[in-house]
C-alpha cells in the first residue's frame, strides 16, 4: 500500500537498523547475480549527423543552449569505434550491457517508414557481437534523444500523438532486434525528461516553468510506456520470451529530525513527488499518488478507470536509477526540513515497502569525477564500493530482491547539462584524440574484481 515507505524514516523495527557491524559487509552476491554496465546513445555514439542520422532535440539543445559545446561529435565515438567498446566490455567481464538505441539514427524524422540502413546495421552488429560474447543486451528505446522533427511538428512529449509514434518505433525494434534482446527498457528516467525538459529547462527541449506542461509530458510518457508494454506482452512476449520495464530514477532524503513527524511527511512527499509520480501508476495502483492528486489537482492530468487498469502492472521488474542526475540541483532541501542522502540501501527499502517487494534491477548507479581526472579515479572507487556495499546489505540483510546492477558508465561521454565538464566512465576517453582509445580507470579494475569475486571477499 502506498505510504508504507514512511516506516524507513521512523526506523520501524521491521526495517533492519544499520548498526556498526553492518557498516560494511564482507559477503557475496547471490549466485547468478546479473552484473552489467551501461551507456546512453547520445552520450557516447557521436556522429550526430553521419550516415543519415537525423537530429535529436539534444543535438539542437546543444547548439542553442550549451554555448561551449560544439556538438556531440566530440563524444567517445562509439558509432565509429564499436570494437573498442566491445573490448572494454570483455575486459570487465560483465553479464550484460545496457545501451540505448538512438531513435533518430533509425528513423531520422521519428516516423516509422523505411529505417536508415546504416543505423540498423550498427545496432544489429552490436547485438550480434554481444550475443557472440555471451553478454546479455539490455536495450533502452528512449534515452532522451527524441527526433527533432517530432518536437518541431508536434511539440514533442506534450502531444499525445507521440504515444502511437513511439509505439510504432518500439514495434519496429521488437521485430528487428527482439530475437537477440531479452530485456527491454522503454524510457530512461522519465522524471528528468518532464521536470528538467519542461520545468527547469536544464534539459532538452529547454522549456521552462510550465507546470501543466511538465505533468502533461509525464502523463504521456507513462501512457507511452504502458502502450508499449501491452504491445510487447501481447504480440512479442509469447515467442521472444523477454521482459520489459521502464527505468525510474530518484534521489534519497533524510529528515533533519528523525523524531519529527512533519519532517518525515516531507521526506515521504519528496520521494512520492519524484519516484512515486511514475512508479505509482506503473508499479502501484495505476494512478498518481493521492498526495500529488490533492496538491496538484487542477494541473495533474486524470487517469480514467480504464486507463488505471491499463497502466497498473506494466513492468516486469523495477528498473531503478540512482545517480547524480537525480541529485542536482540540491539547493532547495534545507528549506523543507530535509537533507539529501546517498543511501541507496534505504531507497531500495522504500521501494520494497511502497511497491510490495518487487524484483529490482539497478539500471543506473555510480557517481562522477571532475573532467581533469584521468585514470586514477579514487573517488569513483570509493563511491562504487559504498553503493555496492549498500546493495549487498539490502539483499542479504533486508531481503530485497535486487537481481542485477548496472555500473554507470562504460565510457566517459557527454553528460547532459554538464556536457564534458564531468566524467562518469569506467574507461577514460581523451575526447580530443583521433582514436578515442578506451583506457581502463582504477574503477574499471575494481569493478572487474567485484564481478570476478561476485562481491566482497575478506
Amino acid at each position: 500500500f502506498s505510504g508504507d515507505g514512511r516506516a524507513i524514516w521512523s526506523k520501524n523495527p521491521n526495517f533492519t537498523p544499520v548498526n556498526e557491524s553492518q557498516l560494511f559487509l564482507y559477503d557475496t552476491f547471490p549466485k547468478n547475480f546479473f552484473w552489467g554496465i551501461g551507456t546512453g546513445a547520445l552520450q557516447v555514439e557521436g556522429s550526430w549527423k553521419k550516415d543519415g542520422k537525423g537530429p535529436s532535440i539534444w543535438d539542437h539543445f546543444i547548439h542553442t543552449h550549451l554555448k561551449n559545446v560544439s556538438s556531440t561529435n566530440g563524444s567517445s565515438d562509439s558509432y565509429i569505434f564499436l570494437e573498442k567498446d566491445l573490448s572494454a566490455l570483455d575486459f570487465i567481464g560483465v553479464s550484460f550491457y545496457q545501451f540505448s538505441i538512438s531513435w533518430p539514427r533509425l528513423f531520422p524524422d521519428g516516423i516509422v517508414t523505411v529505417a536508415n540502413a546504416k543505423g540498423l546495421q550498427y545496432y544489429s552488429t552490436l547485438l550480434d557481437a554481444l550475443v557472440l560474447r555471451n553478454i546479455e543486451p539490455i536495450v533502452t528505446l528512449y534515452h532522451w534523444d527524441l527526433p527533432l522533427a517530432l518536437q518541431e511538428k508536434y511539440g514533442g512529449w506534450k502531444n499525445d500523438t507521440i504515444i502511437d509514434i513511439f509505439n510504432d518505433y518500439a514495434t519496429y525494434c521488437f521485430q528487428m532486434f527482439g530475437d537477440r534482446v531479452k530485456y527491454w527498457i522503454t524510457i530512461h528516467n522519465p522524471y528528468l525528461v518532464a521536470w528538467h525538459g519542461y520545468g527547469t529547462g536544464m534539459h532538452a527541449p529547454g522549456e521552462k516553468g510550465n507546470l501543466a506542461a511538465v505533468y502533461t509530458v509525464g502523463h504521456n510518457l507513462i501512457k507511452a510506456h504502458s502502450k508499449v508494454w501491452h504491445n510487447y506482452n501481447t504480440h512479442f512476449r509469447p515467442h521472444q520470451k523477454g521482459w520489459l520495464s521502464i527505468t525510474l530514477g530518484s534521489h534519497w532524503i533524510e529528515p533533519n529530525r528523525s523524531e519529527n513527524t512533519m519532517d518525515i511527511f516531507k521526506c515521504q512527499q519528496s520521494m512520492v513527488s519524484v519516484l512515486g509520480w511514475f512508479a505509482n501508476p506503473i508499479h502501484g495502483d495505476g494512478d498518481y499518488p493521492e498526495g500529488m492528486r490533492k496538491k496538484l489537482f487542477s494541473v495533474l492530468p486524470i487517469f480514467s478507470e480504464a486507463e488505471k487498469h491499463e497502466m497498473r502492472g506494466t513492468a516486469d521488474f523495477f528498473a531503478f536509477s540512482f545517480g547524480p542526475n537525480n541529485f542536482k540541483p540540491l539547493n532547495t532541501m534545507a528549506k523543507m526540513g530535509q537533507n539529501v542522502s546517498l543511501n541507496l540501501r534505504e531507497a531500495l527499502n522504500w521501494i520494497k515497502l511502497e511497491y510490495n517487494n518487487p524484483r529490482i534491477l539497478i539500471a543506473e548507479n555510480g557517481w562522477f569525477t571532475d573532467s581533469r581526472v584521468k585514470t586514477e579515479d579514487t573517488t569513483a572507487i570509493y563511491m562504487m564500493k559504498n553503493f555496492l556495499s549498500q546493495v549487498l546489505q539490502a539483499i542479504r540483510l533486508d531481503e530485497i530482491r535486487v537481481f542485477g546492477y548496472t555500473a554507470w558508465s562504460l565510457l566517459d561521454g557527454f553528460e547532459w547539462q554538464d556536457a564534458y565538464t564531468i566524467r562518469r566512465g569506467l574507461f577514460y576517453v581523451d575526447f580530443n584524440s583521433k582514436q578515442k582509445e578506451r583506457k581502463p580507470k582504477s574503477s574499471a579494475h575494481y569493478y572487474k574484481q567485484i564481478i570476478r569475486e561476485n562481491g566482497f571477499s575478506l
Partner: antibody
Amino acid sequence: QVQLVESGGGVVQPGRSLRLSCAASGFNFSSYGMHWVRQAPGKGLEWVAVIWYDGSNKYYADSVKGRFTISRDNSKNTLYLQMNSLRAEDTAVFYCARDQYFDFWSGYPFFYYYGMDVWGQGTTVTVSS
Amino acid sequence: DIVLTQTPLSLPVTPGEPASISCRSSQSLLDSDDGDTYLDWYLQKPGQSPQLLIYTLSYRASGVPDRFSGSGSGTDFTLKISRVEAEDVGVYYCMQRIEFPLTFGGGTKVEIK
C-alpha cells in the same frame, strides 16, 4: 500585469440562462486551473466550480450541479460559466480566480498550493422576475 | 460537505493590538498522506475582491506582511495578526480544500474600534 476581467452579468428572469466570461491576460492561461466563486449580497463567499488547466476535469458545488457548466477556451485565454435554470438564490457577484502553485523550479517538485492568488473584480448577476 | 465555522462574527480591534480569528472544521483537514493541512485564509477588504493571505495552514502568500500567521491542528485553526493596522480591516474567510466541494467559513468582520 496579471489580470482577470469578468463580464456577462446582468438582470435575468428565473428559469432563464446567462453566460459569464472571464478574460485572462498577463500569464500563460493554459497552464492554470481556474475557479468561479460567488458572493450573494451581504453574504460570504461560496465556491462554485473549478476546471483543470486543459478542461479535462471539472467539479461543482452541490447547489449548482446540473445547472451550471464551467468551460474554457485556451486559445482565447477565456474562462466561461454557463448558467441555466437560474433561481433567485443565484443572485450574486461572480468572481473568477486563478489556481496558483509554488514554482519550485530550482530543485525537486515539492508542491505547496498557493490557493486562489489572482481574482477578477467580479460581475453581478441578478435573478429577478 | 465540510462545514467551517468562524468565530467571532465581528471583531472590533485597536490598531497596534493583536487580533485572533478562529475557524473550526466539521472534519479533519490534515492529509494523512502528506502531513499537510489544507486550510487557507482570505481577506476581502471593503469594496474589493478577496485576496489570498495564508495557504496550507501556515504559509504566507507573496507580499503578505509577516504580522499575519496561520496555525492549528486537524480541525481547529487560528489566524493571528500580531499588531493590527488600519489597512487590515475587512472580512476574513477560512477555506478548506481537502475535498470537493471546496467550502468557505462564514467570515469574520474585522473593524477598527
